[in-house]
Amino acid sequence: AAMGSCSKEYRMLLGQLQKQTDLMQDTSRLLDPYIRIQGLDIPKLREHCRESPGAFPSEETLRGLGRRGFLQTLNATLGCVLHRLADLEQHLPKAQDLERSGLNIEDLEKLQMARPNVLGLRNNVYCMAQLLDNSDMTEPTKAGRGTPQPPTPTPTSDVFQRKLEGCSFLRGYHRFMHSVGRIFSKWGESPNRSRR
């Protein structure tokens, strides 16, 4: 759905959520370009790019939530993701620097699409919550009550360490979106909240 407008059609909205999470779990859209741009595309360096435990809710945790709780948790987590992506973007090389280094400008464009994509997903999460009559969910553009703070990178002047932290975060993000996608794929054909 376009930002600010909500579809009233449950299956179309669920389809959009399924499509968005399908695309967002694809590492070629975010993690892989990040690795190339940051010069981490070397086997020994890639080994250090592991997901940090606890950075994102596990699939088991998400499955334990009802639809309402799941959407609220997803909304809050996406809020954190938006903050972290903004931080990552600030430390990306500029387009002209990429060209001088012989790196692919398309990789930078993919990274710059991440935040708009997350905003689009968050809007649809909000729309789905409305459709399921979750009146107390915070609008996607506002800070939520009890919304967890974005995971703060370890304070460091080490540029290399920051790159690895970004890499770990993105790996966790893709895994999280994979879990979210699996949950959405199990949602039934009717918006009946009792069916999970």
Epitope: A1, S5, S7, M12, G15, Q16, K19
Partner: antibody, heavy 120, light 106 residues
């Protein structure tokens, strides 16, 4: 090989009914959404209806009162029952499948279509 | 419903040239889908999710765009590419198609 084959088209008088069939092979209708899309002669494409893997249905509001989508799982066949036909329903009717088990409203496999002509 | 307007209605080019087909929505959409249709045949999916090539589609086809404006580009026209092309959205109910762009040999 995934295939869709439509049948049941022909010439019919205005106000009469017709039932189109779409035989699916290479996949099960209970695993995918399958749609009807129509195309009037020399015109563009128009989505008509879908039946999802669990059996729920969605319609284009323009056809909801006159058209009914259904399926027979044992025959792996999709149907479109068209009532109170009008001259403007003259078109090639295609069945087309969604690309996976999610609620995706686009189409990766199409049948060859069956022509319905509504004329007195 | 979202109305998709394709331009130009007809595009006359020669093999080897580059074709740029546009699709504009009356409202913003999340993703765009493109189909090719030859006379007497069913449509064939070319591009899904705005920019992803469908299975078996040659790399000379590419898609781009966001919001209300989307583009299908065919970089090096082959004789078999001359056909009608349709865009489609399903961000808003019901799914709708553009009216088509006919790509013909000059």
């Amino acid at each position: 090989q995934v295939q869709l084959v439509e049948s049941g088209g022909g010439v019919v008088q205005p106000g009469r009914s017709l039932r189109l069939s779409c035989a699916a092979s290479g996949f099960s209708l209970t695993n995918y959404g399958v749609h009807w899309v129509r195309q009037a002669p020399g015109k563009g494409l128009e989505w008509v209806a879908v039946i999802w893997r669990g059996g729920s249905t969605d319609y284009n509001a323009a056809f909801m009162s006159r058209f009914t989508i259904s399926r027979d799982n044992s025959k792996n066949t999709l149907y479109l029952q068209m009532n109170s036909l009008r001259a403007e329903d003259t078109a090639v009717y295609y069945c087309a499948k969604s690309p996976n088990s999610n609620f995706y409203w686009y189409f990766d496999v199409w049948g060859r279509g069956t022509l319905v002509t509504v004329s007195s | 419903e979202i109305v998709l307007t394709q331009s130009p209605a007809t595009l006359s080019l020669s093999p080897g040239e580059r074709a740029t087909l546009s699709c504009s929505g009356s409202s913003s959409v999340s993703y765009m889908y493109w189909y090719q249709q030859k006379p007497g045949q069913a449509p064939r999916l070319l591009i899904e999710d705005t920019s992803n090539l469908a299975s078996g589609i040659p790399a000379r086809f590419s898609g781009s765009g966001s919001g209300t404006d989307y583009t299908l580009t065919i970089s090096n026209l082959e004789p078999e590419d001359f056909a009608v092309y349709y865009c489609q959205q399903w961000s808003s109910y019901p799914p709708t198609f553009g009216q088509g762009t006919k790509l013909e040999i000059k």
